[in-house]
């Protein structure tokens, strides 16, 4: 249940897909991975605001419980509906690989 | 991948399963559910420092942007990694249904 | 824009060695790999074999392994490839391209380079 | 190796004509595969990669499809600039392999 897609906070405020671009250093990844040197990471950044993207009825009742009790229960928050793959080239003990990660990447975003 | 399950925020601090108490009044669902009047709602509360139940590469990502981009990228999220099932008992058009919902109650909980 | 830019043509007895280099530009040459891919006479496209510039990583296709050398020169932002011992099947364009990116795209060319094996 | 079968090895067309190009590998390859158009004399260029992604600039009659090991590129109306040779590219895994190639010919 993919609910409103109409931010009331304004245009690109709530929870929506982002790409930040993060070399290998940034990530941790220098000593493992060979290419690409930098990624172009889509990641799911903003606010989630009454029944904006709501997930499912858990992220319905997290509404309702985080508008009656704000310091017990939190908003739900903006994370990854699904993944899009992505492909690494890597050092391994035989030598270099073509790796693919599924869970790497985000593809579209919800709140949860 | 789980990552770590030691919280260094100290005991209680970091992403687990909560329990609150909520009405029908409370989620908005006294028109149409007629039982339970009260719910003994599961959800996923708490920080998510570096690693902390890390549910997959992109969570890991998302600590490594953090750190160095944290007005940018958000920490990681304390989400349901899946759910209980719950069943309602509600008004219909024709009387009163014994109705299951599967994503309603968190089971246990990751970060994201 | 990027760019990859390839030596000229060259004759080559049979026997000789050919260097082809590909120069890069309007991107970072560190941040992704180089292919070079071979394409005999009216034949299909043949992979030879990739190189990290950042490293000097390489993975050659096991027909080539032991007569073709991949190097690149990051002063430069040039890729090189050497073949050695050749002969006339290797009569072929040469190219370079960038790739894979993180979606195994291949997806920069250069503009080939003739090397014609004949005695 | 992965072995990348490509049919039609060739086809006739006209002007308007919808075609579509399979590719076959020989073993899973996610979707991982590339489609390239090379006209004589010319590098080849990329049209599809990650299966279905359209590359920047290339018209949008041009789509992919498949996972795993079937693929197809489909020029949904065929124009004079699309006669040419196309082929597929898997890059799931090194050695990087191509399919033999479809030439799109004037009917």
């Known amino acids: 249940a993919r609910n409103g897609d109409h931010c009331p906070l304004g245009p690109g405020r709530c929870c929506r897909l982002h790409t930040v671009r993060a070399s290998l250093e940034d990530l941790g990844w220098a000593d493992w991975v060979l290419s690409p040197r930098e990624v172009q990471v889509t990641m799911c950044i903003g606010a989630c605001p009454s029944q904006f993207r709501a997930a499912n009825m858990h992220a319905q009742i997290k509404t309702s419980l985080h508008r009656l009790k704000p310091d017990t229960v939190p908003a739900p928050c903006c994370v990854p509906a699904s993944y899009n793959p992505m492909v690494l080239i890597q050092k391994t003990d035989t030598g270099v690989s073509l790796q693919t990660y599924d869970d790497l990447l985000a593809k579209d975003c919800h709140c949860i | 991948a789980r990552n770590g399950d030691h919280c260094p925020l100290g005991p209680g601090r970091c992403c687990r399963l909560h329990t609150v108490r909520a009405s029908l009044e409370d989620l908005g669902w006294a028109d149409w559910v007629l039982s339970p009047r009260e719910v003994q709602v599961t959800m996923c509360i708490g920080a998510c420092p570096s690693q902390f139940r890390a549910a997959n590469m992109h969570a890991q990502i998302k600590t490594s942007l953090h750190r160095l981009k944290p007005d940018t990228v958000p920490a990681p999220c304390c989400v349901p990694a899946s759910y209980n099932p719950m069943v309602l008992i509600q008004k219909t058009d024709t009387g009163v249904s014994l109705q299951t919902y599967d994503d309603l109650l968190a089971k246990d909980c990751h970060c994201i | 824009q990027v760019q990859l830019v390839q030596s000229g043509a060259e004759v080559k007895k049979p026997g000789a060695s050919v260097k082809v280099s590909c120069k890069a530009s309007?991107?970072?040459?560190?941040?992704?790999?180089i292919n070079w891919v071979r394409q005999a006479p009216g034949q299909g496209l043949e992979w030879m074999g990739w190189?990290?510039?950042?490293?000097?990583?390489?993975v050659y296709a096991q027909k080539l392994q032991g007569r073709v050398t991949m190097t690149t020169d990051t002063s430069t932002s040039t890729a090189y490839m050497e073949l050695r011992s050749l002969r006339s099947d290797d009569t072929a364009v040469y190219y370079c391209?960038?790739?894979?990116?993180?979606?195994?795209?291949?997806?920069?060319w250069g503009q080939g380079t003739m090397v014609t094996v004949s005695s | 190796d992965i072995q990348m079968t490509q049919s039609p090895s060739s086809v006739s067309a006209s002007v308007g004509d919808r075609v579509t190009i399979t590719c076959r590998a020989s073993?899973?390859?996610?979707?991982?595969l590339a489609w390239y158009q090379q006209k004589p004399g010319k590098a080849p260029k990329l049209l599809i990669y990650?299966?279905?992604s359209l590359q920047s600039g290339v018209p949008s009659r041009f789509s992919g499809s498949g996972s795993g090991t079937d693929f197809t590129l489909t020029i949904s109306s065929l124009q004079p600039e699309d006669f040419a040779t196309y082929y597929c590219?898997?890059?799931?895994?090194?050695?990087?392999?191509f399919g033999g190639g479809t030439k799109v010919e004037i009917k």
């Open positions: 391209a960038r790739g894979p990116g993180q979606y195994a795209d291949v997806d920069v």
């Open positions: 309007g991107y970072t040459f560190t941040d992704e790999g």
């Open positions: 190189i990290t510039a950042y490293s000097g990583d390489t």
């Open positions: 073993q899973g390859i996610s979707s991982w």
């Open positions: 990650a299966a279905s």
């Open positions: 590219q898997q890059a799931n895994s090194f050695p990087i392999t």
